[in-house]
Interface confidence: low
């Protein structure tokens, strides 16, 4: 057979549905391999063929589309099971190809089962929200084209095993569920099951996801540096061990890189020659906010370490902050005998 | 606005200090104050900024580092000092401020003052 | 050190017409979206267009409209007008606990015929 531009398995894509479901899975490659889309590639004379490896089997064959009641089909750049069955897991492939054009991606599918309570392997997504501000909304993910607008299916909420109806702050919209205070309480999973007729039979779709209440962009606030601080002197001899934690409280901020680094004498720590390592431990909160510590060690201090200035750095997309550590030498205990003495008339 | 001073013809090996002065304006602490560079002709380079909350937050091109300083002078004025100049250093320096959180772009610039380094 | 690529310069557009400028990070810039669009006319300060990649600044027109994140960026300038012939900046805000916090890309200069 002549060359194909292979794009190999596309890990990247793990596809999960659950087992006995509907579900409808778009050839990847026009999403995210190819210039165009599948109308300019059916158009331009292009077929696109599927096929598939079973799971524990090196062997490709052709899906079978001949199978009662339709139950694989595919539709343009769609391929469609009504429904899945377990054995339905594998690896599979769509090609798209003419007689001097051929381009084709791998993707795994996994049908996985669930309980009566909807636990399963499934990886679910995490939607945050915020915490005591006002009313949100999670949406039943994942569930366009499975049928037609003028299908009104009947949409059911659980939190974990329980159907939602007369929660306090929680009411149940159709295909949204309205939060009207979210609390720490409302953590947990939610699923919607979605119920739908076509050409005669019920289907239904399950989609759970992860709530997850975090601090609110109203309390949000730059970040706090706890450590260093003015009350604190690092007082060393040359010799000892210096160690000084950086630590800093960063509110929850939606998509927020939060960072925390130490300049010596204004520069990162790699860029000068005394050896200094820099261990770092980060915490949260209930609500997501994060506290960050950095400790800045210099085993054997020098004098001329003493004498460096020690800043630590942090920054979030609420802005900057900068405090440096009071680091000096420690004036050597006098010796009695001597020194005092002296200091009381003694010679 | 802003106006930056201190532009003058200096020979290889001179040092030289610009003045960035904010006229209506001060710095809060959320502004970022920056030095930005750009030689005849060609595109512009950043040299430095300054947090101005917090006169330890400083931060350097990789290039900049070592004989150029950045510092705040007052509420409304930043300093750049260069010293070792070179004929590769002739450009117009910009002073601009980046204001509220991070991210937003230099929403301010000065018109620039010249500094021209020649033997 | 950070490097902003951009491309194509010069680009030439009718008025009317549009033009596309992309702007290319060598890492992700801080947070995906931390970059700025401006516009330079000779013997003036630069102008900022666009910030936090997308966002239109203060007083600056509609047809003017950023996109992007993470590496990869795109102004465009819709119903180009003749006094949108200038130098187009991009400019990019990074992590400063690893490298230089801020870069420029290299210009790219609009014609407008």
């Known amino acids: 057979s002549e060359r194909c531009d292979d794009w190999g398995l596309d890990t990247m894509r793990q596809i999960q549905v659950f087992e006995d479901e509907p579900a409808r899975i778009k050839c990847p490659l026009f999403e995210h391999f190819l210039k165009f889309n599948y109308s300019t590639a059916h158009s331009a004379g292009l077929t696109l063929i599927w096929y598939w490896t079973r799971q524990d089997r090196d062997l490709e064959e052709p899906i079978n589309f001949r199978l009662p009641e339709n139950r694989i089909s595919k539709e343009k750049d769609v391929l469609w099971f009504r429904p899945t069955l377990l054995n339905d897991t594998g690896n599979y492939t769509c090609m798209l190809r003419n007689t001097t054009y051929c381009s084709k991606v791998a993707f795994p599918l996994e049908v996985v089962q669930k309980d009566s309570c909807f636990n399963s392997p499934m990886k679910l997504p995490v939607h945050k929200l915020y915490i005591e501000y006002g009313i949100q909304r999670i949406t039943c993910p994942n569930v366009d084209g499975y049928f037609p607008s003028s299908v009104k299916p009947t949409i059911t909420w659980y939190m974990g095993c329980y159907k939602i109806q007369n929660f306090n702050n929680v009411i149940p919209e159709g295909m949204n569920l309205s939060f009207l205070i979210a609390l720490i309480s409302n953590n947990g999973n939610y699923t919607c099951v979605v119920t739908y007729p076509e050409n005669g039979r019920t289907f239904h779709l399950t989609r759970t996801l992860t709530v997850k209440v975090v601090g609110s962009p109203k309390n949000a606030v730059p970040p706090v540096i706890h450590s260093p601080n003015d009350h604190v002197v690092y007082e060393k001899e040359p010799g000892e061990e210096l160690l000084i934690p950086c630590t800093v409280y960063f509110s929850f901020l939606m998509d927020s890189r939060n960072e925390v680094w130490w300049t010596i004498d204004g520069k990162k720590p790699d860029d000068i020659t005394i050896d200094v390592t820099i261990n770092e431990s980060i915490s949260h909160s209930r609500t997501e906010d994060e506290t960050r510590t950095q400790i800045l060690s210099i085993k054997k201090v020098t004098s001329e370490d003493l004498k460096r200035s020690y800043v630590c750095h942090a920054r979030s997309a609420k802005g900057e902050v900068a405090k440096a550590a009071k680091v000096k030498q420690k004036v050597p205990a006098p010796r009695y005998t001597v020194e005092l003495a002296c200091g009381f008339g003694a010679t | 606005s802003l106006e930056e001073s201190g532009g003058d013809l200096v020979k290889p090996g001179a040092s030289l200090t610009l003045t960035c002065t904010a006229s209506g304006i001060s710095f809060s602490s959320s502004d970022f104050m920056c030095w930005v560079r750009q030689a005849p002709g060609k595109g512009l380079e950043w040299i430095a900024c300054i947090y101005a909350g917090s006169s330890v937050s400083i931060y350097y091109a990789t290039w900049a580092k070592g004989r150029f300083t950045i510092s705040k002078a007052s509420s409304t004025t930043v300093t750049l000092q260069m010293a070792s100049l070179t004929v590769a250093d002739t450009a117009t320096y910009f002073c601009a401020r980046s204001t509220g959180s991070v991210g937003r772009g230099f929403n301010l610039w000065g018109q620039g003052t010249l500094v021209t380094v020649s033997s | 050190a950070q490097v902003l690529t951009q491309t194509p310069s010069p680009v030439s557009a009718a008025v009317g017409g549009t033009v596309t400028i992309s702007c290319q990070a060598s890492?992700?810039?801080?947070?995906?979206?931390?970059l700025s669009w401006y516009q330079q006319k000779p013997g003036q300060p630069p102008r900022l267009l666009i910030y936090s990649a997308s966002t239109l600044a203060s007083g600056v027109p509609s047809r003017f409209k950023g996109s992007g994140s993470g590496t990869q960026f795109t102004l465009t300038i819709s119903g180009v007008q003749s006094d949108d012939a200038a130098t187009y900046y991009c400019?990019?805000?990074?992590?400063?606990?690893?490298?230089?916090?801020?870069?420029f890309g290299g210009g790219t200069e609009v014609v407008v015929k």
């Open positions: 890492q992700s810039v801080y947070n995906s979206n931390h």
């Open positions: 400019q990019g805000e990074f992590s400063c606990v690893s490298a230089d916090c801020i870069a």
